[in-house]
Amino acid sequence: IWELKKDVYVVELDWYPDAPGEMVVLTCDTPEEDGITWTLDQSSEVLGSGKTLTIQVKEFGDAGQYTCHKGGEVLSHSLLLLHKKEDGIWSTDILKDQKEPKNKTFLRCEAKNYSGRFTCWWLTTISTDLTFSVKSSRGSSDPQGVTCGAATLSAERVRGDNKEYEYSVECQEDSACPAAEESLPIEVMVDAVHKLKYENYTSSFFIRDIIKPDPPKNLQLKPLKNSRQVEVSWEYPDTWSTPHSYFSLTFCVQVQGKSKREKKDRVFTDKTSATVICRKNASISVRAQDRYYSSSWSEWASVPCS
Amino acid sequence: RAVPGGSSPAWTQCQQLSQKLCTLAWSAHPLVGHMDLREEGDEETTNDVPHIQCGDGCDPQGLRDNSQFCLQRIHQGLIFYEKLLGSDIFTGEPSLLPDSPVGQLHASLLGLSQLLQPEGHHWETQQIPSLSPSQPWQRLLLRFKILRSLQAFVAVAARVFAHGAATLSP
């Protein structure tokens, strides 16, 4: 058993049929010694008396808010949560496996630049009685500070018969050094509590591996005289690290119709302009990627050919 | 060329070669991003390799003030990785695929380090750690880790030279 926060405790249980469970001793936070009784949740049934209460925690029915009273007055509370371990593996019932970029990916994180700011998100089908708390650091043995905000519900979508809820959190490394080569990864830890179930999820990454620039901005077209060709120009996204002579991007320019199966023109360039062939009913799209490190491409920025 | 005395390197040549290094480092191990090597006890390996750190002057302001600190750090790293790529880790079993770009990568690391430090000038170089894994599978894992960390190192070096070529070239 360990303390998650004040008056909230997590009991770690091996979860299998007829498991013996864990013996837990609760102590009432009071100077009083006599006339103390214990109850669980809303029940008025007295579970025991005395300054301490010893219980055998085996299942969710044994978890909940234990309260010690004296003469009708509440003295203190202890909330017990369960963390299940099945076949040596901690349960992951609360969050959905996003399966990208690999199986057992519960947390996904992205950064728009090298400033040390990043966003992580996760998915669940649970809509109520759900709380998250996020901590982060650079490195684990001698951790350096990363400050995370509160996790918020950022999207809801319908997937078949189920509703899916996306939560996200923004974090900022306290002393970021955008130009340095990272040697210690960022660690992100998410505590998830659903009703009386506790689970924790972790992710470890370098900012360079989660970079995904915003799409290029201000796409403009200039038809070339006596030619089918069009000069397309664009600018670096505002959110990208500066100076651009140091933090350079490379670009992919593509002309394609509405369907992915249609023919296309495609060219790669380090410049912020390119010459392509425009077709009626097609769009010109441009996306960006770090020039020197193969992290994710941005989403496409598009303008119609016409 | 960058010499200990403090003259300027051939920024444009260094830029071209460092960008080539980036391409080669990724073609040597393109799927590196899909392999979570941190789970495999990274500490003993990649903590020994030289990293370009915050105080090394490789940021745009540091380069403007005095690029020599940064260039010396890059040079140390290039020599270090050049030695690693020529070591038993890469030459031993399992043999590299014949079409592996590691050979080109090795030669290009040497080429860039020579651009930075011509014959007859000496910057102190970092001691290469004795990483001699006994098992072929350990060697394979070590290669992946070294290439992954090399990708990060050459990316910073390429940014330095690109910025230098754009803003510091005479």
């Epitope: 249609e262 296309k264 077709r279 | -």
Partner: antibody, heavy 118, light 107 residues
Framework: QVQLVQSGAEVEKPGASVKVSCKAS????????LHWVRQAPGQGLEWMGW????????EYAPKFQGGVTMTTDTSTSTAYMELRSLRSDDTAVYYC???????????WGQGTMVTVSS | EIVMTQSPATLSVSPGERATLSCRAS??????LHWYQQKPGQAPRLLIY???QSISGIPARFSGSGSGTEFTLTISSLQSEDFAVYYC?????????FGGGTKVEIK
Amino acid sequence: QVQLVQSGAEVEKPGASVKVSCKASGYTFTDYYLHWVRQAPGQGLEWMGWIDPENGDTEYAPKFQGGVTMTTDTSTSTAYMELRSLRSDDTAVYYCNANKELRYFDVWGQGTMVTVSS
Amino acid sequence: EIVMTQSPATLSVSPGERATLSCRASQSISINLHWYQQKPGQAPRLLIYFASQSISGIPARFSGSGSGTEFTLTISSLQSEDFAVYYCQQSNSFPLTFGGGTKVEIK
């Protein structure tokens, strides 16, 4: 599968014109760009231009501008390349090729030998 | 127009050996570079597109690398059917241009 079959060899006199055909099969004709590339005997490859069968748009290499016309007939899935004012150095194998991507050449025809000789 | 230069013009290699072919562009072309193989009396065949992307059906012994102005085609272990002429082609800008070719012959 995608296939391009070209017309047979031609022998022409200097100053004449030649029209080479290229019949496509195995795909929707308007879904691919069509290019023409030539190769003089013992020499390298030379790009001549492309046509979009969907709308008849063309782009020719500057060297061939004014001397070449590329057309298509969507009813027969056939592309044509006409080269005018032939000279002896136009002697070459002419290839048509098709691709969904505009700038490189995936599927090639077998080639048509055009000999220009007086 | 962009001029593509291939070297060497002829490469003599023994079967089973590795062959490294070079292609240089007269200006930076990013990764807009493609490789073709041509055997006598046949049309060229696409091997690699956008500098390093492999084509399904092409043996894994063919690999490409490079960006900017310098590119390499590597054939890891030459088979008898690999003796041919190899061309690079840039697609950075029109007109599309080819290198002069490298003939890989049996040593």
